[in-house]
Amino acid sequence: QSPIFGPQDVSSIEGNSVSITCYYPDTSVNRHTRKYWCRQGANGYCATLISSNGYLSKEYSGRASLINFPENSTFVINIAHLTQEDTGSYKCGLGTTNRGLFFDVSLEVSQVPEFPNDTHVYTKDIGRTVTIECRFKEGNAHSKKSLCKKRGEACEVVIDSTEYVDPSYKDRAILFMKGTSRDIFYVNISHLIPSDAGLYVCQAGEGPSADKNNADLQVLEPEPELLYKDLRSSVTFECDLGREVANDAKYLCRKNKETCDVIINTLGKRDPAFEGRILLTPRDDNGRFSVLITGLRKEDAGHYQCGAHSSGLPQEGWPVQAWQLFVNEESTIPNSRSVVKGVTGGSVAIVCPYNPKESSSLKYWCHWEADENGRCPVLVGTQALVQEGYEGRLALFDQPGSGAYTVILNQLTTQDSGFYWCLTDGDSRWRTTIELQVAEATKKPDLEVTPQNATAVIGETFTISCHYPCKFYSQEKYWCKWSNDGCHILPSHDEGARQSSVSCDQSSQIVSMTLNPVKKEDEGWYWCGVKEGQVYGETTAIYVAVEERTRGSPHINPTDANARAKDAPEEEAMESSVREDENKANLDPRLFADEREIQNAGDQAQENRASGNAGSAGGQSGSSK
């Protein structure tokens, strides 16, 4: 008895495809060893046709694949464009030779079945429309026309020219003639269902002088496309249902017994299990759309179907496309936190993993929005301007070679709660979803900046201090000047570092930053933060206003930007953010990254000079820890 199992007999017809699944015992050795498909010869030798090592024989070139699914302990051999020459005895097996563990499979490929003379074969997918062509002689031009379906010896009328329509074809069948043609009539049957398959006879006239045509209708349910994805990665279902349903609502559903549960549709329905990790994106005006799901879970594996119907729900007789999704638990994508918690006024540092082989790829961070189809406008990127409403409080820190980048968001409000995606313009599997939960703060923040009303005067010296608690004693403290392309670290002076850690005085742990002399371009947002190596921690932000001191004029503070940052609701900024993005509603963020890159290019030279000046404090010798 072989421990390998599969179909003993497989039968198909010429031109068709087969997908043969072989099951093997679930052991580590079996999961990783060579899988093969070979043809048994009369001499007892089994000639390899395809193997998981990459071998592909000449006769299978361009028409076969072998996919291993270690998570399911199966491998699948797909063979397309079958011919009668493919009929024979095969083995699917495991091992370095073709004598290892195997299972015998018999494949029989038949000719397309013979039908009565003059039978026209129509092959259509479920939900589509077939047009059956019926020829007749001039003598029957004014006679009754009909189409009937063979059921055993009987032939039951489907439709005729007296306007009779069988109830099961009501609103689906029409009989018509085109133009001035006097020798052909046509029957359209739309919204095809599996039970429509069979042999049809069309007839013009009655009795022995009647003209008859045979039509064989084959209605195919779409063969699911196999998708094999890693745990925590993402999958895109590309759905192309054709122009005839371009204006109907679209959906993606997951099969459950004989029903199909809608996951998302264009009418606003969305399964809560996919909240924050799904996007439906129309691709063009011809009804093409795609559905992207990120953060794949083991339970996401299954049989998916996309379709279209005005109700946004699956309906029999409407076109569909199908996929079988397998989720591999042996994932290359690291397990990262799926929920990050913060408090109002505080900050979060979110670590985004990416494919370490693609360290030069552009990194992005977007905010998933639960409009009807889901959308994810980019908030920040390695070469993307920070979105309006996030100035001074959002930055992306790339750590080339580490396989991760960090996104810091500070001055948190409860409105920041929601789902965010990490993505790159490289390997699309590496998209991760993070849920940010912001609760109301119950205590003072760990980092506090003084003075809070920060106004510097051009030409003078300006020092700003950041107070930190003893728990941050051993961490690296830094000041950075925020700009649209990140937060550039500045030289700073750590007052607390002079003390021994034993006698840490909670009140005197200070890291300060001095601007000397102050320049107009020093105006802007500054961050005080802590980090350990490449791991970023808490940050706080302050806006430094710069003004000219005119002789004799009183010193008046400008509008307090810091108070605005801490207290003001963000509706205004949000509104403008939405306005900017409304035309990009459902685009993959990568598609408009280039546009932001162009906007950003002009800012960089100026920013680099400014951050250099900001750190040119007189008599200061860089950062001390």
Epitope: T74, I126, E221, K257, E258
Partner: nanobody, 126 residues
Framework: QVQLVESGGGLVQAGGSLRLSCAAS????????MGWFRQAPGKEREFVTA??????????YYADSVKGRFTISGDNARNTVDLQMNSLKPEDTAVYYC?????????????????WGQGTLVTVSS
């Protein structure tokens, strides 16, 4: 809802033949799996054979214990499946269940079928 009704069970002598039928009423599918399982008195239910329709092709699976003796056939347009049992042995005595799965995927030997019939008794006397 899909209903499965088995027929054809009965008493037969060892070495004899029997043909079981299963009819599925309800929605028609062009892609699904139908199988036969059996349960002998005091034993676990076990896989016997299955037939899978997918993409215009037909796949037939058999347990080692029935290979060469039992043949599964079916008509997916009519939602019926038959089991021809030849060279019957006393150890084939069991209640035979018809099962249907509305997806062509998954191990046909598994219990993850969506619908099950009530069963028909096959007794093979020696």
């Amino acid at each position: 809802q899909v209903q499965l009704v088995e027929s054809g069970g009965g008493l037969v002598q060892a070495g004899g033949s029997l043909r079981l039928s299963c009819a599925a009423s309800g929605r028609a599918f062009s892609q699904y799996t139908m199988g036969w399982f059996r349960q002998a008195p005091g034993k676990e239910r076990e896989f016997v054979t299955a037939i899978r329709w997918s993409g215009g092709s037909i796949y037939k699976y058999y347990a080692d214990s029935v290979k060469g003796r039992f043949t599964i056939s079916g008509d997916n347009a009519r939602n019926t499946v038959d089991l021809q049992m030849n060279s019957l042995k006393p150890e084939d005595t069991a209640v035979y269940y018809c099962a249907a799965r509305m997806s062509p995927w998954g191990d046909p030997r598994g219990n993850e079928y969506d619908y099950w019939g009530q069963g028909t008794l096959v007794t093979v006397s020696s």
